[in-house]
Amino acid sequence: EEELQVIQPDKSISVAAGESATLHCTVTSLIPVGPIQWFRGAGPGRELIYNQKEGHFPRVTTVSDLTKRNNMDFSIRISNITPADAGTYYCVKFRKGSPDHVEFKSGAGTELSVRAKPSAPVVSGPAARATPQHTVSFTCESHGFSPRDITLKWFKNGNELSDFQTNVDPAGDSVSYSIHSTAKVVLTREDVHSQVICEVAHVTLQGDPLRGTANLSETIRVPPTLEVTQQPVRAENQVNVTCQVRKFYPQRLQLTWLENGNVSRTETASTLTENKDGTYNWMSWLLVNVSAHRDDVKLTCQVEHDGQPAVSKSHDLKVSAHPKEQGSNTAPGPALASAAPL
């Protein structure tokens, strides 16, 4: 009679992570008597996957009923495959022996490759805000994919970026891989509504590439521009001085009026006007009682934006420039009238 052969018909099989893998194995003879065992890998360090006679293998089921007398099909099914299950599986026939069974013949092996989708890309930006014209770095990470081949692209508002570096780890063979990319982005004053997108494409993705996004509103700080102007008002002896705070982001802003260097009033921006580009405008005003001043007055609008050092703009109020016919008199009264923002 011909010697027993162990036949593993599949040289390689590919399985999606989470699915089951069927590893086929048949023998050509019932002789010699002895069990079948499945191993992953070869040599002394091989890993036992299934033992027909003993042991607990919760993820492994046999395709045929091994208790049937003439069974020659020793195929197994491994459930819930993960990338860690990748490798070459050997169906090995043992000859009954005492005290131990003796390895008799091995199949040629079936290589199991596992395809796994990349995780959704996560994009993170710098820890601190930066101002326009500065270059900031964004990182994108995705994990757990196999095979290793993957493409990653960066976009800012739909325009592809070219200044980035990408690494896929590990460099050698592995059960699964991760990708890490860092892109450099130059900020502009119009970037409050901008988005940075990291796009990952992989063979396992049936839809469009996976995308991770970061809103530049979380990264950018647009400092305000200040303008101080004065207009006469109908009431005698009063001048309206306004401080226009324009095109700033984020909203957090505190304004202080100084009269000849002395703090007059501090207020926090509340009712803001939003511009189309996402920045904000705000206006604060003072009613100045000119008659209370003998000398010229230096009015300063000082703005502290988003915890940054204060910026200021001054305006010289010339007392001599207000003759009586323009509403100037020498009656006593408060130098500064209380004023609320418009």
Epitope: K11, S14, I150, T151, V203, G207
Partner: antibody, heavy 116, light 109 residues
């Protein structure tokens, strides 16, 4: 699980023609689908695919000659301005469950003849 | 686009014999290569994907191998039912585009 093409007929140059691929046993929202063609006595040629989310991608030679779209149960290939060179059997196919690198379910094809 | 060069364009072999078909990609395709069988008037049938993985239900007489740019389909123990045209098809993971070889007609004597 199967796919089948329809709409093949005798057409005239310049007159738009739309082919339809009808699927059964699976959802178009889960798989990439492709269109291919084979001129008489020639080899297979890739035209384009549409992703599970509905985004079309075309072979570089297409240059607007074809438009791929889909509904919940069918995928269409519109021949925008056919020429006699577009005479071929057109196949639709579904990519494999493991990835988009191969096509494991093909339709029987539908013949388009473009003639003056 | 990647160009796939398939050789030979035609091959003849006897029943029980072996046929080898080669496919060369213009650049590395990282094993993203499939093989199809097509008989006259019929749809293509997937045989092998990812260079060497046998599609379910395909006899183990069909064997795919190769990596990088060079790939091979070997059909052993030829049967008369194997008479057909065989195509290789690549997928390029960067351009995400497909390309076919020119085909090989297998004649079984």
């Amino acid at each position: 699980q199967s796919v089948e093409e329809s709409g093949g007929r005798l057409g005239t140059p310049g007159t738009p023609l739309t082919l339809t691929c009808t699927v059964s046993g699976f959802s178009l929202s889960s798989y990439v689908m492709g269109w291919f063609r084979q001129a008489p006595g020639k080899g297979l040629e890739y035209i384009g695919i549409i992703s599970s989310s509905g985004s079309p991608y075309y072979a570089s030679w297409v240059n607007g000659r074809f438009t791929i779209s889909k509904t919940s149960t069918t995928m269409d290939l519109k021949m925008n301005s056919p020429t006699t060179e577009d005479t071929a059997t057109y196949f639709c196919a579904r990519v494999g469950p493991l990835g988009v690198d191969y096509f494991n379910i093909w339709g029987p094809g539908t013949l388009v003849t473009v003639s003056l | 686009d990647i160009v796939m060069t398939q050789t030979p364009s035609s091959v003849e072999a006897a029943v029980g014999g072996t046929v080898t078909i080669k496919c060369q990609a213009g650049q590395s395709i990282n094993s993203y290569l499939a093989w199809y069988q097509q008989k006259p008037g019929q749809r293509p049938k997937l045989l092998i994907y990812y260079a060497s993985t046998l599609e379910s239900g395909v006899p183990s007489r069909f064997k795919g191998s190769g990596s990088g740019t060079d790939y091979t389909l070997t059909i052993s123990d030829l049967e008369s039912a194997d008479a057909a045209t065989y195509y290789c098809q690549s997928w390029h993971y960067i351009s995400r585009s497909y390309a076919f070889g020119g085909g090989t007609e297998v004649v079984v004597k």
